[in-house]
């Protein structure tokens, strides 16, 4: 006969083990007993479990409710045992020894692998702006065993750098995201992907990246100036910017205080009907907590009656 | 090489009992556990039971009361006994041999009726 | 189609430690086994079939299907009481 087992068996920190010990044998072969230890280099044999075919199940003190055997329907050749709860400790070498009638002993080794997966967490850098040069986005650590894979996943480009800290029983795996900050980037995602094979798939974070900027800012408004005229309602001048964090607008006239009646909105100047007095220089002034900027533009409201020599009345008659 | 013949009858009265008979060859009854599984439209594969190697048995809970798994070593014969048939437990019923945890051969099926 | 390459899931409600067997069935034979405890091929078993998982999650694989392969398949779990799936039936489009 001949015992069939694994060489290596592999189980998640918490999860339970099968330790597989299956004698195959000739004719007529019994199996009597099935003894189970732990039996790492340059340590003593540490029993775990006795499973007898006439007396059944003795666990070892040291794990007491921890070993089981599998459930019935059971082949009494199988001398497999199932260990609960794995921690790391558990990690080692096993020894599954079968005594059989008549063919005597056989022994067989396998190796149990606790598998940590890493609980990966990920910091953001220091707040981005434009302008600034190669700057650390975002840093992402996993500690495992083995150690984990540690990767980005991402539309934006930069450069990623990687260091290792081993343990004792285990690694931590730090990479780091570095850019150089564009208005671009902004609201783009930034994925740290840790992969491990105590992982049923990869575990990802994701981080939005916010980089602080503030465009020029421009007044529309002014396209046709022949518009403001004298009596004209509903006009109005917007200032065009944008940043983040978005800004906030503020309007001033140049050449004194701004005119009654005149409506500020936000981003948006609104004028009463037209008369002279609302010409002069308008300024809008945007900023946010990055930057400031200024825009200014010159009004200037036309009186149509000064135009009335170069007008043609046709008067008909009949 | 390795295989499973089956013989029994194919119709079966209510109330009535069912025998097959699974004669093995190319491997010997001392070394490997034979199963037995059936297959019906309503409940497709079920597993009914198993004799091993060493002579003892388990049963389906859901037929432990009626069901009976026994075997002649010396003549390569295992021999299937269920009680009380009714109309649903017509089906195809099988024997096959046990590989650890599995089934790696399957005799070639007995269609069973249950109608009178 | 012939020449894709096609998965079989197979969920159990709990951990069956790799205790899983795969079988394909034809119309009117009986069903041949194709992979044991999960990974390992049954002798005969062409090499486009494998299996893997572990735990509650396992999957039978078949790269380059030939016509032959197109059948019902079965998943089969040995923890406690052996019990099969519903089974997959493969059809040629």
């Known amino acids: 006969g001949e015992l069939e087992t694994s060489d290596v068996v592999t189980v998640v920190l918490g999860q339970d083990a099968k330790l597989p010990c299956f004698y195959r044998g000739d004719s007529g072969e019994q199996v009597g007993q099935v003894a189970w230890a732990r039996v790492d280099a340059g340590e003593g044999a540490q029993e775990l479990a006795l499973l007898h075919s006439k007396y059944g199940l003795h666990v070892s003190p040291a794990y007491e409710g921890r070993v089981e055997q599998p459930p019935p329907p059971r082949n009494p050749l199988d001398g497999s045992v199932l260990l609960r709860n794995a921690v790391q400790a558990d990690e080692g070498e096993y020894e599954c020894r079968v005594s059989t009638f008549p063919a005597g002993s056989f022994q067989a080794r396998l190796r149990l692998r606790v598998l940590v997966p890493p609980l990966p967490s990920l910091n953001p850098g220091p707040a981005l702006e434009e302008g600034q040069g190669l700057t650390l986005a975002a840093s992402c650590t996993a500690e495992g065993s083995p150690a984990p894979s540690v990767t980005w996943d991402t539309e934006v480009k930069g450069t990623t750098s990687s260091r290792s800290f081993k343990h004792s029983r285990s690694a931590a795996v730090t990479s780091e995201f570095h850019l150089v900050p564009s208005r671009s980037m902004n609201g783009q995602p930034l994925t740290c992907v840790v992969s491990h094979p105590g992982l049923l798939q990869d575990q990802r974070i994701t981080h939005i990246l916010h980089v602080s900027f503030l465009a020029e800012a421009s007044v529309r408004g002014l396209e046709d100036q022949n518009l403001w005229h004298i009596g004209r309602e509903g006009a109005m001048l917007k200032c065009l910017s944008e940043g983040q964090p978005p800004p906030s607008y503020n309007w001033t006239r140049l050449d004194g205080p701004l005119p009654s009646g005149v409506r500020v909105d936000g981003d948006t100047l609104g004028f009463p009907p037209l008369t002279t007095e609302h010409s002069g220089i308008y300024v809008c002034h945007v900023s946010n907590e990055f930057s400031s900027r200024d825009s200014q533009v010159t009004v200037d409201v036309l009186d149509p009656q000064e135009d009335s020599g170069k007008q043609v009345d046709l008067v008909s008659a009949s | 090489q390795v295989q499973l013949k089956q013989s029994g009858p194919g119709l079966v009265q209510p109330s009535q009992s069912l025998s097959i008979t699974c004669t093995v060859s190319g491997f010997s009854l001392t070394n490997y556990g034979v199963h037995w599984v059936r297959q019906s439209p309503g409940k497709g594969l079920e597993w009914l039971g198993v004799?091993?190697?060493?002579?003892?048995?388990d049963y389906n809970a859901a037929f432990i009361s009626r069901l009976s798994i026994s075997k002649d070593t010396s003549k390569s014969q295992v021999f299937f006994k269920m009680n009380s048939l009714q109309a649903d437990d017509t089906a195809i019923y099988y024997c096959a041999r046990e590989l650890i945890h599995a089934m790696d051969n399957w005799g070639q099926g007995t269609s069973v009726t249950v109608s009178s | 189609s012939v020449g894709e390459t096609v998965t079989i899931t197979c969920r159990a409600s709990?951990?069956?430690?790799?205790?899983l067997a795969w079988y394909q069935q034809k119309q009117g034979n009986s069903p041949q086994l194709l992979v044991f405890?999960?990974?390992n091929l049954a002798d005969g078993v062409p090499s486009r079939f494998s299996g893997s998982g572990s735990g509650t999650q396992y999957s039978l694989k078949i790269n380059s299907l030939q016509s032959e392969d197109f059948g019902t398949y079965y998943c089969?779990?040995?923890?406690?009481?052996?019990?099969f799936g519903g089974g997959t039936k493969l059809e040629i489009k």
């Open positions: 405890a999960a990974t």
């Open positions: 004799i091993w190697s060493g002579g003892s048995t």
């Open positions: 089969q779990h040995f923890w406690g009481t052996p019990t």
């Open positions: 709990e951990n069956i430690y790799s205790n």
